[in-house]
């Protein structure tokens, strides 16, 4: 019997300082570019090597960005979200949602090393 996949959802405030080449990540999503079905939220699709986000280390690909400098990202067109980041200034505060996949064992869990497992 297969274990089911659950998700552990956590939120975090990440403060980034814009580097010489900017914040250093890509986004997907928006009301006109739904990346996740039935969710027009904004998600991180790429972290650029040696960019501000990569050097900070906390923002991850797949994270959902809930707000930028306190401004909610709900119900935004994709380009409006991009522009919000571009105009966010030198010090940028991101409220993000991490979604960590957790593999649960099957019901009637067998101990490690059990060859029938």
């Amino acid at each position: 019997m297969n274990g089911r996949v659950d998700y552990l959802v956590t939120e975090e405030e990440i403060n980034l300082t814009r580097g010489p080449s900017g914040l250093g990540f890509n986004i997907v999503g928006g009301t006109d570019q739904q990346y996740v079905s039935n969710d027009s939220g904004i998600y991180v699709s790429r972290i650029k090597e040696n960019g501000a986000a990569a050097l900070d280390g906390r923002l991850q690909e797949g994270d959902k960005i809930l707000s930028v400098n306190g401004q909610d990202l709900k119900n935004l067109l994709h380009q409006d979200a991009v522009d919000l980041f571009r105009n966010a200034g030198y010090a940028v505060s991101l409220r993000v949602q991490h979604r960590l996949q957790v593999q649960n064992g099957p019901i009637g869990h067998r101990g490690e090393g059990d060859p029938s497992g």
Epitope: S45, K48, H78
Partner: nanobody, 127 residues
Framework: QVQLVESGGGLVQAGDSLRLSCAAS????????MGWFRQAPGKEREFVAH????????YYADSVKGRFTISRDNAKNTMYLQMNSLKPDDTAVYYC?????????????????????WGQGTQVTVS
Amino acid sequence: QVQLVESGGGLVQAGDSLRLSCAASGRTFSTYTMGWFRQAPGKEREFVAHINWSGSSTYYADSVKGRFTISRDNAKNTMYLQMNSLKPDDTAVYYCAVTIGSPVDSYRHGDPLEYDYWGQGTQVTVS
């Protein structure tokens, strides 16, 4: 993993036209930021054109402006480069390139490091 396959290259005469295609894998094609680059023998890879996720924004190298047109069909997972009034200087291997999503920083269209996935290229020769 994104896979890109270019097609449409060939041998043509100066003044002729060609249309290159770049077919991409992945269900999220409509989120891709895409570009065309080219590399002539003995030269560095050179930026040609760029298109945003929706096709509403395009950008061209000065050397091709007014002659080349970049476009995309998100329903077909394909990007195109229509090349008119071809010149011998346009002879090169043409590559399509992709990054997933839109950069939140001012986009450096011509920087190959902005792109994560590359096709194998298609040869264009203008005699």
